[in-house]
Interface confidence: low
């Protein structure tokens, strides 16, 4: 509309008692330069006098007279486009409507700006993303609808009352569109931050507390689990019973399913927090863990290595090498599955015990023909003695002996 003066400034400005207010403002007059400027507080138009009544905070005419008591109010504008104002300090009773009465040679205009001054520093506002998940970086934003050149402030982040180590980026805006101070903090919350209190604290230049806002973190995370086993060392004998218990130390949201895994494979029909293994066999040795899921995903406990101890199984003998040439060396190895490992071995040659041979390996450095035959062994551990297996045959090759001609 070409019949109007054009102004741009924030609609409402916020401050508190004793602070200041900086009002960014631009204008375009209908004709020529500004000749007179009066800043009113709560102006009202008087039809009788065809003038505005109200407290005059600032007055600037062609004569350049400024009321001496209003030094706290400054007009920082010019005669054709800038109408920026500063009030320092600002008082509670400055709240209300500011009226900018502008006059050029032929035209007049009253522009209104709202000023909201609170008794005490008002709190900033923390903005969080709609959902926070563990280990995913989020930006926490603290916004304060205040900024003024004459009143420096700072925003500080606290976690459970302790300053946060992460570097925050503070920005200010003092434009015709908006006036604010904003602090942004990039943060990768862990599950343990769930339920913790984050505070954005408004401080003055000296670090003195002015106000704050707090939020409670709602960190979505997979279930966090603890596994307990009886007996605690997870070492049992064949035939014993084992109980494993899965405890959920934290889950957000609630957990929905429970399962048990052995060596990475899910155990069928085991969907409770307790795993009872009765009369265990050696095949049940392995790594066990529990897995509990919620809407975020599955959580796994640490692994428990279950060792089922048993007496040695029937042993087998491995010969390196058969057939053997007379004079060569041969090694015999007694192999028997056992837990714990066998500590003692008994060796047999053609059914007769070989005295002094108690090791897993028997080494014969120089084979003679009489060494040929069947070798077997018996393994022994703390749980008992195994059975003698079928044994292995040593064949000794040698050149003709005692040649006789017929």
């Amino acid at each position: 509309d070409s019949s109007k003066w054009v102004f741009e400034h924030p609609e409402t400005l916020y401050a508190w008692e004793g602070a200041c207010v900086w009002i960014p403002c631009t204008y375009r007059a209908l004709d020529g330069d500004l000749e007179s400027f009066i800043l009113f507080h709560n102006p009202e138009y008087n039809k009788n006098t065809s003038k505005f009544d109200g407290t005059r905070l600032y007055e600037s005419t062609k004569d350049g007279k400024v009321p001496s008591e209003q030094k706290r109010v400054q007009f920082l504008g010019d005669k054709n486009k800038n109408c920026t104002l500063s009030i320092h300090p600002v008082h509670l009773n400055d709240s209300g409507q500011l009226g900018l009465r502008m006059e050029s040679k032929t035209e007049k205009w009253m522009e209104r700006i709202h000023l909201n001054v609170s008794e005490r520093p008002f709190p900033p506002h923390i903005q969080l993303p709609p959902e926070i998940q563990e280990s995913q970086e989020v930006t926490l934003t603290c916004l304060l609808n205040f900024s003024c050149y004459g009143y420096p402030i700072q925003l500080q982040w606290l976690l459970e009352g302790v300053p946060m180590r992460q570097a925050a980026v503070t920005s200010t805006s003092l434009t015709i569109k908006s006036v604010f101070t904003r602090s942004e903090l990039k943060f990768s919350p862990q599950w343990s931050h769930h339920g913790k209190i984050v505070t954005c604290q408004l401080q003055d230049a000296d670090g003195k507390f002015l106000s704050n806002d707090t939020v409670q973190l709602n960190v979505k995370h997979t279930p966090k689990l603890e596994i307990k086993v009886t007996p605690s060392d997870a070492i049992v004998r064949e035939g014993d019973s084992v109980t494993m218990t899965c405890e959920v130390s934290s889950s957000n949201p609630e957990y929905t399913t429970v399962s048990w895994l052995k060596d990475g494979t899910s155990l069928k029909k085991q969907n409770t927090f307790t795993l009872n293994l009765r009369e265990v066999t050696k095949d049940q040795s392995g790594k066990y863990c529990c897995q509990v899921s919620n809407d975020v995903g599955p959580g796994r406990s640490e692994e428990v290595f279950l060792q089922v101890q048993y007496a040695p199984e029937p042993s087998t003998v491995q010969i390196l090498h058969s057939p053997a040439v007379e004079g060569s060396q041969v090694e015999f190895l007694c192999m028997s599955l056992a837990n714990p490992l066998p500590t003692n071995y008994t060796w047999y040659h053609n059914g007769k015990e070989m005295q002094g041979r108690t090791e897993e390996k028997v080494h014969i450095p120089k084979i003679l023909p009489w060494h040929a035959g069947t070798y077997s062994c018996v393994a022994e551990n703390i749980l008992g003695t195994g059975q003698r297996g079928p044994g292995a045959e040593l064949d000794v090759q040698y050149p003709p002996k005692k040649v006789t001609t017929v």
């Epitope: 959920v248 130390s249 934290s250 609630e254």
Partner: nanobody
């Protein structure tokens, strides 16, 4: 904001039963977990039991397991604490509370955002 009002307290003989009720109003949609706590004279406020938002999970303090149970009436926005086989040591002011931040904090009184004013339960021997 959530408002909580407890009722149902009173004087009962040892071995008797009571049913406490906690009626929630206000922003009840955002309630996640409801807990019952109690405070005996000169003692700290202690966890009694909790109920999850879905109603799927309940938890009780060891001292009341097998005697106290928690249930809810969604239509009435009410949670109940059923107390059987009451003992003189159960004498306390019973409070209901709500928190929004996860089952992990069900026993931690500091995590509860809103509290009722409490109802007195006295068990005489």
């Amino acid at each position: 904001q959530v408002q909580l009002v407890e009722s149902g307290g009173g004087l009962v003989q040892a071995g008797g039963s009571l049913r406490l009720a906690c009626a929630a109003s206000g922003d009840t949609v955002s309630i996640y977990y409801m807990g019952w706590f109690r405070q005996a004279p000169g003692k700290e406020r202690e966890f009694v039991g909790a109920l999850s938002a879905s109603g799927q999970f309940t938890d009780h303090a060891d001292s009341v397991k097998g005697r106290f149970t928690i249930s809810r009436d969604d239509a009435q926005n009410t949670v109940f604490l059923h107390m059987n086989d009451l003992k003189p040591e159960d004498t306390a002011v019973y409070y209901c509370a709500v928190q929004r931040y996860g089952w992990v904090y069900r026993t931690d009184k500091t995590m509860y955002n809103y509290w009722g004013q409490g109802t007195q339960v006295t068990v005489s021997s």
